[in-house]
């Protein structure tokens, strides 16, 4: 059994004020079931910037379709980027428990940071 | 109580089109992947087309890839099927189907909740 | 395609099992019962082994490794149908199995 490695390629992404960025993660393993959140930041104040489950995210969408059962992208996109935007991002799988979900893995992480502005 | 809908079947020519509707009700429609089987006469059962819950993503069955549009509306709970260049093997009873909680088009393992189905005839 | 048997038998009261495999890497499977050609399918059991309410719990499912099993207690004349099983492949595009045929002898 394959043990589950998380993705995230890019260190670093360079992005401009009002444009939508991409933060890519995959996962190698559709095991152990559990959902993928992605936060900035890590420990107890990071932010959560996409739950699947719950919430409302409106700036951000999905690249894949994270509810078909061989989905293996958990990539997203945040539209209208801002300077408050920058930081590092991390995708986190999260094995099912009861009552609650249980952290198991993180990736690397991205860090956004703002490029120069087109000329 | 669940209900699916189906309508918009009947005799249709070969290499006409036709389109599909199913109405769903007693549930929360847009919280819910929906997917199209169907089935020939004496034959098994054959998925056609599924889309996610949101309406974002789409998947076809190879028989049908580059003929069918499948498209939902979750303001008015429906689902269309479109499916063109018919062919005397596109005759069949369609259903249209329900995931219950789980999955997305195609994964035909969640599928809680079927319709009475609708007949199509293609025929000359 | 998913493979399951062509035909299996039972005496009323008795245990069934009809078994499916092909499912892709992420497999589950469900099971739909149609108990004459053109009258609509109904699920017995999705997602491996959730049970419809209006199903009655005779029937059951479960996964072993990458087999999926769908178990009818107690079988009765009324459980005479043909059983389907669903998931999907590895390219997540749907697919049934050929079906299999319950016969409740007696």
């Known amino acids: 059994e394959e043990e589950l490695q998380m993705i995230q390629p890019e260190k670093l992404l360079l992005v401009t004020v009002g444009k939508t960025a991409t933060l890519h993660c995959t996962v190698t393993s559709l095991l152990p079931v559990g959902p993928v959140l992605w936060f900035r930041g890590v420990g107890p104040g990071r932010e959560l910037i996409y739950n699947q489950k719950e919430g409302h995210f409106p700036r951000v969408t999905t690249v894949s379709d994270l509810t078909k059962r061989n989905n293996m992208d958990f990539s997203i996109r945040i539209s209208s980027i801002t300077p408050a935007d920058v930081g590092t991002y991390y995708c986190v799988k999260f094995r099912k428990g009861s009552p609650e979900n249980v952290e198991f893995k993180s990736g690397p992480g991205t860090e956004m940071a703002l490029g120069a502005k087109p000329s | 109580a669940v209900t699916l809908d189906e309508s918009g079947g009947g005799l249709q020519t070969p290499g006409g089109a036709l389109s599909l509707v199913c109405k769903g009700s007693?549930?929360?429609?847009?919280?819910?992947?929906m997917n199209w089987v169907r089935q020939a006469p004496g034959k098994g059962l054959e998925w056609v087309a599924g889309?996610?819950?949101?309406?974002?993503?789409?998947y076809y069955g190879a028989a049908v890839q580059g003929r069918a549009t499948i498209s939902r509306d979750n303001g008015q709970s429906t689902v269309r099927l479109q499916l063109n260049n018919l062919r005397a093997e596109d005759t069949a009873t369609y259903y249209c189907?329900?995931?219950?909680?789980?999955?997305?088009?195609?994964?035909?393992?969640?599928?809680?909740?079927w319709g009475h189905g609708t007949e199509v005839i293609v025929s000359s | 395609a998913l493979t399951q048997p062509a035909s299996v038998s039972a005496n009323p009261g008795e245990t069934v099992e009809i078994t499916c495999s092909g499912g892709?890497?992420?497999?589950?499977y469900g099971w739909f019962q149609q108990k004459s050609p053109g009258s609509a399918p109904l699920t017995v059991i999705?997602?491996?082994?959730k049970r419809p309410s209006d199903i009655p719990s005779r029937f059951s499912g479960s996964k072993s490794d990458s087999t999926g099993t769908l178990t009818i207690t107690r079988v009765q004349a009324e459980d005479e149908a043909v059983y389907y099983c669903?998931?999907?492949?590895?390219?997540?595009?749907?697919?049934f199995g050929a079906g299999t045929t319950l016969t409740v002898l007696g």
């Open positions: 999705y997602d491996n082994g």
């Open positions: 669903g998931s999907a492949d590895n390219s997540g595009a749907g697919v």
């Open positions: 007693g549930f929360t429609f847009s919280s819910h992947a």
């Open positions: 189907t329900k995931n219950g909680g789980c999955g997305s088009g195609g994964d035909l393992d969640c599928i809680d909740a």
């Open positions: 889309i996610s819950s949101d309406g974002r993503f789409t």
């Open positions: 892709g890497s992420n497999n589950a």
